[in-house]
């Protein structure tokens, strides 16, 4: 799925309202310190792609989140605000279902959860050119003209 | 601990240029926007710019645009502010500051600040 | 740039009493329904510290005789019972728009 239409602004809201808590309360008790951030992302299209893949795409030690609380929040957040999301997942949320039979938590999903969190502070806060300035090239908000 | 630690207070000649550190430990250096923001003596606080260490991309305060460099060197985790042709009216303190851990924008953890007076 | 205009410039309130700041932007802060704008505190030879984000979040630690309020140019920063080691400059600062932009403080005092 190509994220470059989504209205960042309101995804961004949708994180800090309540994704945000739910990241927290998953990670509750877990040092910030205890993992280093391998994952990162150049713009927010990226960011989203990079958060999709970690949070719905199984991996080895972690085999699925999607069925945590924040998981499900962002899934309703794209498929709200990304034009054409909600189609491109069907086929993907039914082999979800058939994979995942029960919650359990590791320490690798903590640190994919850790990396999380650092893709969506990334996400929230691109250095986004300023009108006038040449300092460097962003693409992704040609429609979203706040910073923040 | 997350802490940010800045370099010793400089004075300098005007027409001069000055390079502030800022070293970070207890967090993932590459991953948070970090900022400076400066405070003339008795006034009030002014945000110059941020840099992203992760790649090095800045936002700059158009009022020191021509000026101010900011640059990253993620091997010590240090962030740099470098001001060039330096006048009397940069007399301040200089901040190095982190943005939060939730992406709200804050700034939740300060360097002590490092006073550059710029003094003929 | 958005200029952020705080007020009074100075106060003065006495222990126990209710003191009010206000800060005024020149555009609206608010983005999708979020308000972008935090309140800090700094005391002599410190650096800031945050005691309000996004207009009404109280920083972690901050006491809770501290609140926000407002939305879109408006916003208000309430110490409901003045103590002693309240006494510093207040500073709001907008994060909606680049440049960022701080209010030009407020000095609290103890009447």
């Known amino acids: 799925y190509d994220f470059t239409n989504c209205d960042f602004e309101k995804i961004k809201a949708a994180y800090l309202s309540t994704i945000s808590k739910d990241l927290i309360t998953y990670m509750s008790g877990t040092k910030s310190t205890e993992f280093n951030n391998t994952v990162s992302c150049s713009n927010r299209p990226h960011c989203l792609t990079e958060i999709q893949s970690l949070t719905f795409n199984p991996t080895a030690g972690c085999a699925s989140l999607a069925k945590e609380m924040f998981a499900m929040k962002t899934k309703a957040a794209l498929a709200i605000w990304c034009p054409g999301y909600s189609e491109t997942q069907i086929n993907a949320t039914q082999a979800m279902k058939k994979a995942r039979k029960s919650k359990v938590t590791t320490n690798k999903c903590l640190e994919q959860v850790s990396q999380l969190q650092g893709l969506w502070r990334r996400f929230n806060r691109p250095l986004l050119k300023q009108q006038g300035s040449s300092d460097y090239k962003d693409d992704d908000d040609k429609h979203h003209h706040h910073h923040h | 601990e997350v802490q940010l630690v800045q370099s010793g207070a400089e004075v300098k000649k005007p027409g001069s240029s000055v390079k502030v550190s800022c070293k970070a430990s207890g967090f993932t250096f590459s991953t948070y926007n970090m900022h400076w923001v400066r405070q003339a003596p008795g006034q009030g606080l002014e945000w110059m710019g941020a840099i992203y260490p992760g790649n090095g991309e800045t936002s700059y305060n158009q009022k020191f645009k021509d000026r101010v460099t900011l640059t990253v060197d993620k091997s010590t985790s240090t962030a740099y502010m470098e001001l060039s042709s330096l006048r009397s009216e940069d007399t301040a303190v200089y901040y190095c500051?982190?943005?939060?851990?939730?992406?709200?924008?804050?700034?939740?953890?300060w360097g002590q600040g490092t006073t550059v007076t710029v003094s003929s | 740039d958005i200029v952020m205009t705080q007020s009074p410039d100075s106060l003065a309130v006495s222990l126990g009493e209710r003191a009010t700041i206000n800060c005024r932007a020149s555009?609206?802060?608010?983005?999708?329904?979020?308000?972008?704008m935090h309140w800090y505190q700094q005391k002599p030879g410190q650096p800031p510290k945050l005691l309000i984000y996004r207009a009404s979040n109280l920083g972690s630690g901050v006491p809770d005789r501290f609140s926000g309020s407002g939305s879109g140019t408006d916003f208000t920063l309430t110490i409901s019972s003045l103590q002693a080691e309240d006494v510093a400059v207040y500073y709001c600062?907008?994060?909606?728009?680049?440049?960022?932009?701080f209010g030009q403080g407020t000095k609290l005092e103890i009447k």
């Open positions: 555009e609206s802060v608010d983005n999708s329904g979020l308000s972008f």
């Open positions: 600062q907008q994060i909606n728009t680049d440049p960022l932009t």
């Open positions: 500051a982190r943005e939060d851990d939730y992406g709200e924008g804050y700034f939740d953890v």
